[in-house]
């Protein structure tokens, strides 16, 4: 006799990094026939949804219309078919961004380097934070954590053309509350035929799309649930 149903998948749209006062949708995908889904936040019930008709729906969306620091944290969901409940989903870390201040990102020796050169990024924020995050825009996961009183350094080591791309950093006030993003720094690494854009598998995005945080770490991964647990989510564990 099966005691529980398989765990559902959970993810955030458009992104797990949510600017304060913006809307985010938490998606929970279970099974067709599920009559109720529950979203839990930090261990307590946050919301309930009863899809109609349940036999034609296997995913629900929980809307958070106005993101703030009180709603940043760890979410999970469960679903019910008849009287049988599922295992809880993996944890989703929801991060609120655009809190307080904007860090400054710089790169040494400069934004244009030759393949093989040692490159270090510096993220500086003159407010009460000691953790910093460096993110590379694109589909793949390029997130580093650094520590420092007002500045953290992120040594990339000898770079290759794979390091080309646009970087931003955040100050982190806690695991789930991050600063505004820094201005972007585009790293150009010569030694490849094309050095003014990212490789096709790691595309750049127009600058204005950063505001919706569609472009770092999870884009292209959110829908591929098997990959959900790695990427930037692991930094928050």
């Amino acid at each position: 006799q099966q005691q529980t149903l398989p765990k559902p998948f959970i993810w955030a749209e458009p992104h797990f990094m949510v600017p304060k006062e913006k809307q985010v949708t938490i998606c929970c995908q279970g099974n067709y026939g599920a009559v109720e889904y529950q979203l839990h936040f930090e261990g307590s019930l946050f919301a309930v949804d009863r899809p109609k008709p349940p036999e034609r729906i296997n995913k629900v969306q929980f809307y958070i219309p106005d993101m703030n620091s009180r709603m940043a944290g760890q979410y999970s969901c469960i679903y019910r078919v008849g009287e049988l409940w599922s295992e809880p989903s993996n944890l989703l870390d929801l991060v609120v961004t655009e809190m307080y201040d904007t860090p400054t990102l710089s790169v040494h020796p400069g934004p244009e380097v030759i393949s093989g050169e040692k490159v270090t990024f510096y993220c500086r924020l003159d407010t009460a934070t000691s953790m910093f995050l460096l993110l590379k825009e694109g589909r793949s996961s390029h997130v580093q954590r650094g520590y420092g009183k007002v500045q953290a350094e992120f040594p990339l080591g000898p770079v290759t053309t794979a390091h080309r791309g646009t970087y931003r950093c955040f100050g982190s006030y806690n695991n789930h509350a991050w600063s505004f993003p820094s201005e972007p720094v585009k790293l150009l690494v010569t030694g490849d035929i094309e050095n003014t854009s990212l490789a096709p598998e790691d595309p750049t995005f127009p600058a204005d799309t950063w505001g919706t945080y569609l472009l770092t770490t999870e884009t292209g991964l959110q829908k591929d649930h098997a990959l959900w647990d790695h990427t930037a989510q692991n930094l928050l564990r």
Epitope: A47, V48, D49, K52, Y63, P65, R70, M71
Partner: nanobody
Framework: DVQLVESGGGLVQAGGSLRLSCAAS????????MGWFRQAPGLEREFVAA????????YSPDSVKGRFTISRDNAKNTLYLQMNSLKPEDTAVYYC????????????????????WGQGTQVTVSS
């Protein structure tokens, strides 16, 4: 934003009933998922009941299930809480709250999901 005004509170004997109302103005109530919360002196605000925006699905915690019923009349722009078999431990200030969600079916049980709040109405249950 929507403005919310609660009414219907008062003093009632244990075992009695009350019906709270929450009148909305400024925006149509059908744009909001709604909830009732309560706060007794010295205690945290506690979830009592919630109702989805369109589907009318409801949720209540075990402490009031079977005794309290939440309902809404979108045409009258009013939310209700029917409270039966009242107990002294139900004594509190009762607040209605609104969440501007696009979802027709989400039912919110967490106070931080609600952006608009009424001023509250006092309910006192004597033994």
């Amino acid at each position: 934003d929507v403005q919310l005004v609660e009414s219907g509170g008062g003093l009632v004997q244990a075992g009695g009933s009350l019906r709270l109302s929450c009148a909305a103005s400024g925006r149509t109530l059908s744009s909001y998922a709604m909830g009732w919360f309560r706060q007794a002196p010295g205690l945290e605000r506690e979830f009592v009941a919630a109702i989805s925006r369109i589907s009318g699905d409801t949720y209540s915690p075990d402490s009031v299930k079977g005794r309290f019923t939440i309902s809404r009349d979108n045409a009258k722009n009013t939310l209700y809480l029917q409270m039966n078999s009242l107990k002294p431990e139900d004594t509190a200030v009762y607040y209605c709250a609104a969440s501007a969600t696009p979802s027709a079916t989400n039912i919110y049980t967490n106070q931080y999901a609600y952006g608009d709040w009424g001023q509250g109405t006092q309910v006192t249950v004597s033994s």
